[in-house]
């Protein structure tokens, strides 16, 4: 997960943007990755960078416990 | 209407600290970033550093070695600039500006004239 | 850093005339397709005002005799024609990255 966060945020060259992105990363379980975004103000450009952060993360975490899953059966 | 109103013009003695205050107004100060700039006699913009004041997350400009430091009072919707070890070719006027969508200054303080003089 | 290099540093223009300043950025400013280059005017004992930003949108209440223009790394504002108010240093600047940068500056003076 650290690495493919890592490997998008290295594009972000406005440290507010990649901060954005890391602000995605977090776990949230009770709201969407779009719910989080719509609160966004400081601009387009952290909303763009926290939503694919936070879909990415989000996928990967998925897969990840889908994994656990298979391997506990 | 939005308005950037920076502290009064100041005279310091080498080595001695600064410390310029831009009061925001006309919006919600939390929403965008603060930038500072600043601008030798005769000499073009320079950029020195940033404060996005919801989250206190700051960057500097390289060139300051650590000498500048940026801050914001979100009760008081006001952000500071302070220069420390200041040397005569600090002697500039400083301008705080507020960048909309992280893309561009749409609005700018009146400027603060630091002077350093022994 | 992006190094910004505008040209000329100085001109002279007559009213009704066109003015052209260039600003070449030493990398590309472009981000999937939005160009974050900015254009300033700025007068004696004044701070800079916003005349162009993203490149070529017009800033509310700049006249439309000033335009701006360039994708990657060449830039260029165009005022046309020329007026007596015009007389001002002009700067781009770039937001693509941090460290945010200024071009040198360019006078523009009325003939």
């Known amino acids: 997960l650290q690495e493919k966060i890592e490997e998008i945020a290295a594009k972000y060259k406005h440290l507010v943007v990649k901060k954005c992105c890391y602000d995605g990363v977090r776990i949230n379980h009770d709201e969407t990755c779009e719910q989080r975004a719509a609160r966004i103000s400081v601009g387009p450009r952290c909303v763009k960078a926290f939503t694919e952060c936070c879909v990415v993360a989000s996928q990967l975490r998925a897969n990840n416990s889908h994994k656990d899953l298979q391997l506990g059966r | 209407q939005v308005q950037l109103v920076q502290s009064g013009a100041e005279v310091k003695k080498p080595g001695s600290s600064v410390k310029v205050s831009c009061k925001a107004s006309g919006y919600t100060f939390t929403d965008h970033i603060i930038h500072w700039m600043r601008q030798a006699p005769g000499q073009g913009l320079e950029w020195m550093g940033y404060?996005?004041?919801?989250?206190?997350?700051?960057n500097y400009n390289e060139n300051f070695k650590g000498r500048v430091t940026i801050t914001a009072d979100k009760s008081t919707s006001t952000a500071y600039m302070e220069l420390s070890s200041l040397r005569s070719e600090d002697t500039a006027v400083y301008y705080c500006?507020?960048?909309?969508?992280?893309?561009?200054?749409?609005?700018w303080g009146q400027g603060t004239t630091v002077t350093v003089s022994s | 850093d992006i190094v910004l290099t505008q040209s000329p540093a100085s001109l002279a223009v007559s009213p009704g005339q066109r003015a052209t300043i260039t600003c070449k950025a030493s990398?590309?400013?472009?981000?999937?397709?939005?160009?974050?280059m900015n254009w300033y005017q700025q007068k004696p004992g004044q701070p800079p005002k916003l005349l162009i930003y993203a490149a070529s949108n017009l800033d509310s209440g700049v006249p439309a005799r000033f335009s701006g223009s360039g994708s990657g790394t060449d830039f260029t504002l165009t005022i046309n024609p020329v007026e007596a108010e015009d007389t001002a240093n002009y700067y781009c600047?770039?937001?693509?990255?941090?460290?945010?940068?200024f071009g040198g500056g360019t006078k523009v003076e009325i003939k």
């Open positions: 500006a507020r960048e909309r969508n992280l893309e561009y200054f749409d609005y």
């Open positions: 990398q590309s400013v472009d981000y999937e397709g939005f160009n974050y």
């Open positions: 404060i996005y004041p919801r989250e206190g997350w700051t």
């Open positions: 600047q770039q937001s693509v990255e941090d460290p945010h940068t």
